[in-house]
């Protein structure tokens, strides 16, 4: 009986010679449960797992706990991955997070996090960063240290508000903090001066809504 | 569509007096706290004053403190920040934003710089003799 092979991550796809961008099934080491997955296999060096994606506001990021979770939308365009599968993933291995932020004036920038993993859901997935590089700003614009993930129905931020509903999206959220790439979705010419958009304040700074963001992962010693 | 148009700048001679006014549109002072921030040449943006007219809560950074008076007029959603005693380290672009008044860390009373989402274009305001 043949074996099937599985990967837990774009960094095995690719180094199982699948060397292509595209949408692949994942699944964690001791799991029978699924999910698909874009995988970027091109930018430096190739081997990542996208976990977020902001486009073109085709998807509404404004969702429930379970939704952040389990993930939404699609892996070919805009999507969450899920909460869950990223959890386990990033306490199974060291990991490194890469976010790629594009503004409409055609201009791009990421921020580089040599260690990132997230909390399992008992902790509220709590993100921890370390080793910030990049072009994206000096600073981090997730607040540090780390915060516990909220969404609409979930408010676990450090605000007398709600930051998930006053900002809309699922996001870690301090009070309410200098990110939120979960935000909405403003077109150009309708993107400045926003409470609610897709913020990274290190490098657009306040009120600024971004065109593009991608958050991917990839193992640290890949 | 959010809106903040400053006004009001201009030169002045060491000792004297101006009132800077900020119009806000697309909101309601109510619901919104607004800080004035001032920028000098190859400086860093700081805050001046802030108000929270839901509560009356009013701001000033110690170097403005006895000197600059911030208030509201919530029936033309205008901020005013009048500014005594003019010195020529008080030169600058000022400056007015807004930020959701709820948007507070618990025990905390003001705001962080990048909290402040929308921003006038502002205003020049030079002290000199």
């Known amino acids: 009986k043949e074996e099937q092979i599985s990967f837990r991550d774009c960094a095995e796809v690719f180094k199982s010679g699948h060397t292509t961008n595209g949408v692949y099934t994942l699944t964690l080491p001791n799991s029978t449960e699924e999910v698909k997955a874009y995988c970027d296999m091109e930018a430096g060096g190739g081997g990542w797992t996208i976990i977020q994606r902001r486009e073109d506001g085709s998807v509404d990021f404004q969702r429930t706990w379970k939704e952040y979770k389990v993930g939404f939308g699609n892996p070919s365009g805009e999507y969450w991955l899920g909460n869950e599968f990223v959890s386990q993933l990033t306490n199974q291995q060291r990991y490194v997070l890469k976010i790629h932020l594009k503004d409409w004036e055609g201009n791009e920038a990421y921020s580089l996090y040599e260690h990132f993993y997230l909390s399992s859901e008992e902790l509220n997935y709590r993100i921890h960063l370390k080793g910030l590089t990049g072009t994206a700003g000096k600073i981090s614009s997730i607040s540090q240290p780390g915060n516990d993930f909220s969404t609409k129905d979930a408010d676990n931020d450090k605000c007398i508000c709600k930051c998930s509903q006053m900002l809309t999206g699922g996001w870690w959220f301090d009070a309410c903090g200098p990110s939120n790439l979960n935000g909405m979705y403003y077109p150009q010419r309708q993107n400045t001066n926003k409470f609610n958009g897709i913020k990274w304040y290190y490098w657009k700074g306040s009120g600024y809504s971004l065109k593009g963001t991608t958050m991917m992962i990839r193992p640290a010693d890949f | 569509e959010v809106q903040l148009v400053e006004s009001g700048g201009g030169l002045v001679q060491p000792g004297g007096s101006l009132r800077l006014s900020c119009a806000a549109s697309?909101?309601?002072?109510?619901?919104?706290?607004i800080g004035w921030f001032r920028q000098a040449p190859g400086k860093e943006r700081e805050g001046v004053s802030s108000?929270?007219?839901?509560?009356?809560?009013?701001y000033y950074a110690d170097s403005v403190k006895g000197r600059f008076t911030i208030s509201s007029d919530n029936s033309k959603n205008t901020v005013y920040l009048q500014m005594n005693s003019l010195r020529p380290e008080d030169t600058a672009v000022y400056y007015c934003?807004?930020?959701?008044?709820?948007?507070?860390?618990?025990?905390?009373?003001?705001?962080?710089?990048?909290?402040?989402?929308?921003w006038g274009q502002g205003t020049l305001v030079t002290v000199s003799s």
């Open positions: 934003a807004a930020v959701p008044a709820g948007r507070l860390r618990f025990g905390e009373q003001w705001y962080p710089l990048y909290e402040y989402d929308a």
């Open positions: 697309g909101f309601t002072l109510d619901d919104y706290a």
């Open positions: 108000i929270r007219d839901n509560d009356g809560s009013t």
